[in-house]
Structures are given as C-alpha cells and as structure tokens.
C-alpha cells in the first residue's frame, strides 16, 4: 500500500527493525541466538532464547536440563517445552511418598484396605488410597469395593503397620508406614536380621530422606538424603542430578549427595553453549594440534566457523592444500597439543580451563 | 600463580569497534591455546573463538568476519578485535587458558573478572 511506504523506509533504515509486510508494522529484530515468541516482535522482552532440545529456559534464563521420566515407576504427566521442564508422576496404581522438583523419588503401590475396612478416598498420583471402617452390618466381603462404601462420620483412622518379615511373608503386598503396600519385589529389599527391631512402619519427619549415618542423641551430624540420581541443592530440596547420556557428553563428576552430576564434552570436543552443570551444545574441537614445532604464521593462519559434523567425526587435522603443506604422517590425537607442551603449560588445572576468581564464585 | 586479566571493554555504538586485551601472568601463551567467552545477562556462556599456540584462529559463526583474534608473546598478551559491532554482542567477555580442558556448565566462574562490552543502538 502506498500509504505504508514512509514507515516501511523508515523501518528499514533502522539495522534494529524491519518491515513485515503481511501485519504491515515495522517489527524489532530479535537479535543473534533469540527467537520470536510472536510474528512481529515489538521490542526485546519479544525475544526468547532457545534452548537445545531437552533443555528449558529456567526462570533466571538459563538453560537447564529437563528431568527424566525414564524410571520404571514414572509416566511423563507434561513434556519438556521452552519454558518448563518435563513433569514426571507415579505411574498409575502408585503414589508419590517422596516428591523432588518435577519428579518423585519413590513411588510406592497404593494400599488396599485390609479387611473390615473400605475405600474412604481412592490413591492418586500424589496420595496413598485413605481406608476407613466398614459400616455396622456391611459384609466383610464388601470391605474393599468402592462401590461397597457407605457414608461414615468416624474419624479417619491409619492402618497400623504391621511388620512383616518379607523372607517369611507370603503377602504379595506389605504394609509400611501409613498402611502403604510395597509390591514385593520392592519390599524384599527390606529385610533385617532376625530378632532385629523392625523399622518398617516408623514414623519419620522426612520420608524418604535418611541420616548419613545413625544419629547419637544430641548431635546435629545428620543430614537429609535424596533417593539416587538427585542431590541435596542449596535449598534443601531433592533435585535431578543432571543426565550425561547425550552422545557427546561425558561424565566429569559424579551425582553427589549435595551435588549434581556434571558432565563435559567427550574428548576432542569443546563446549560451544554452555547450561548448568553440563553442555547445550559440543562442537569437534577446531584446531588440530601441530606435529611438532610451531607452523609459520602466515602458512598456519587459518579461520573456520563452529559447526557440528554428526557424533563421532572430529575435525579435517590434514593441512588445507591452499597452505601448499603436506598432510601430517601421523593422526595426532587431540590433546597432543597440551601434552606435548605440557612443559610450558606450568600450572594450569587440567579440570577445567582455568580458575582465578578467589572469591569462590 | 596463574592469573589471566581481561581490559578494553566499554559502551559503544551499534558499527563501532573495540579492541580487547587478556594478560596473563604465571605461564606463557606459547603452551596452551587461549579461547574468549562471552556471558550476556541471563544468557548461558557462549564460545566466541579460539586462537592456538601457533597463531591459527577459529570464531563461532556469528561473529566470523567482524572480530579477529590475535596474539604477542613476547607479551604474553592475546587481543580480541570486535568491528561493526551489534547490540546483540553485548556480554561480558573472557578470556581462558586451554579451552580444551571443557567448562563445568556455567563457564564463566572459571575465569577472572572478564571485561563488559555494551552495544548500544
């Protein structure tokens, strides 16, 4: 439209905007690496960045690996998307006794109401199913049905737990703490030495958590632990120990009772976008290391961009022919580089590229 | 000890240049190779370039034909050169010893104080 024209030139004469023509406005230009969340965007908070897949967009804008659901015992409740992580929950017939951000840490079977008791609320994903007493002159029969159930204006009570030696028991359930069932393959892990007393059943402020070790009376030696493949974080919640499954990742530290997991580029790769505790994105490391001695600069001088050949390639090490060299005899290895220099290296940590903030930032 | 210091940072205007400047003390830069890293708010840290003990120089794609990399031995200084600058290369940058020992996630605590460019438009 003609009428459009001034604010199309003058759009275009600036490097921060351009013109759309199917909404007719003049729209801000996300800049490098960020991406629109509408089809005009009109100024920067328009913008987003975009993590790699897997990855979320945390709320201090940082991308953060989402958690896994790949347990056994977890269904994905909703999927990874830009700005939330996946959301896991028990799988159906289990309930959540331990919850950790997003996730749950141990599920357990829902309890069925033993006899002389019925179905007060049934389990969901989050609770264990609540029983109560069957009414006056309901057939024990009916003490599990729900369709058995009658109003009852008692109290609700707890099923006391009972504890069962699962090497004697013949249950296919046993009862823990709460009138939770445990299926018995996950209570066969409970056994104790006979004449023991049982903790099955004992009270805890902090399911699922334990002490590092026996409490003495008094001390303050204890500490919460998370189940396996989470961490104590700063906050003193259990959260997902990062995963370094990704092809070009390796593990660099392990998950630690209050630390995560860290994970690096596998060797001959280096980290080109970085996340939290780990890597959005490995690129083959770029320079090839010289045989021996140092090239002439104006045949080594050579520029090339940060791209990401499939899983498994490393970079051309083979001089270009437009430097007029040969091709190496030999393959050097990656690191070569660093370890046939390592004299001249002096201290530098091997760990990580090199630390100098005293300030334990 | 080794110590690596960033300088040569400021506000400029969109199309401008810069010159940036790493010094480092307690090794010399004719071992390792040397790499610069940005970190814009909120952002993760991203790899800008790297040069090698021997001189040859590689730049991530967005960058590539706007900012050189170089080097002076006798010294022990590595520059970082940025022209037509864009808002978008606003970030703090660093500079870091052998970029192949890789970063723990947040790469930018690893490093020293690093120095600001700010592009405005």
């Known amino acids: 439209f003609p009428q459009d024209r001034p604010f199309e030139d003058t759009c275009r004469g600036n490097p921060g905007h351009y013109y759309d023509k199917a909404v007719r406005r003049c729209c801000y230009r996300c800049p490098t690496g960020l991406f629109p969340t509408q089809q005009c965007p009109q100024r920067p908070a328009d913008c987003r960045k975009q993590c790699e897949p897997d990855y979320y967009l945390d709320e201090a804008g940082r991308c953060t690996a989402c958690v896994s659901c790949s347990r056994d015992d977890l269904v994905e409740k909703m999927p990874c998307a830009w700005n939330s992580s996946r959301v896991c929950e028990c799988q159906p017939g289990m309930f959540c006794a331990v919850s950790v951000v997003n996730s749950c840490a141990r599920c357990f079977f829902h309890s069925v109401c033993p006899a002389g008791m019925i179905v007060k609320f049934p389990g969901t994903a989050q609770k264990n199913t609540v029983c109560e007493p069957a009414s006056p002159g309901v057939s024990p029969a009916c003490a599990s049905p729900e369709n058995c159930k009658e109003p009852s204006s008692g109290t609700i009570p707890q099923a006391k737990p009972t504890p069962v030696s699962p090497a004697t028991s013949n249950a296919s359930t046993m009862p823990l703490r709460g009138g939770t069932r445990l299926a018995q393959e996950a209570a066969s892990k409970l056994t104790r030495a006979p004449g023991s007393p049982s903790s099955v059943g004992r009270p805890s402020s902090d399911p699922g958590l334990s002490p590092t070790q026996p409490c003495p009376q008094g001390s303050g030696d204890c500490r919460k632990q998370c189940e396996p493949d989470y961490y104590l974080d700063e906050a003193g919640r259990c959260t997902a120990c990062v995963s370094c499954s990704r092809d070009d990742l390796v593990e660099k530290t392990p998950c630690a009772w209050n630390s995560s997991r860290i994970c690096e580029c596998r060797p001959g790769m280096i980290c080109a976008t970085s996340a939290t505790n780990s890597c959005a994105r490995c690129v083959p490391y770029p320079i090839c290391a010289a045989e021996t001695g140092t090239k002439p600069q104006d045949m080594a001088e050579k520029d090339t961009t940060f791209e990401a050949p499939p899983v498994g390639t490393q970079p051309d090490c083979s001089p270009t022919p437009e430097n007029g060299e040969a091709p190496a005899s030999t393959s050097p290895t990656l690191s070569s580089l660093v370890d046939s220099q390592a004299s001249k290296t002096l201290p530098i940590p091997t760990s990580a590229p090199i630390a100098l903030s005293s300030t334990g930032k | 000890q080794v110590q690596l210091v960033e300088s040569g940072g400021g506000s400029v205007q969109a199309g401008e240049t810069l010159r940036l400047s790493c010094t480092a003390s307690?090794?010399?830069?004719?071992?390792?190779?040397m790499a610069w890293y940005r970190q814009a708010p909120g952002n993760e840290c991203e790899l800008v370039s790297i040069i090698s003990a021997d001189g040859r120089t590689y730049y991530t794609d967005s960058v590539k034909g706007r900012f050189t990399a170089s080097q002076d031995n006798a010294k022990n200084t590595v520059s970082l050169y940025l022209k037509s600058l864009q808002p978008e290369d606003t970030a703090v940058y660093y500079c870091?010893?052998?970029?192949?020992?890789?970063?723990?996630?947040?790469?930018?605590?690893?490093w020293g104080p690093g120095t600001q460019v700010t592009v405005s438009s």
């Open positions: 307690g090794f010399t830069f004719d071992g390792p190779d």
């Open positions: 870091a010893a052998d970029p192949r020992r890789n970063c723990r996630g947040n790469c930018c605590g690893n």
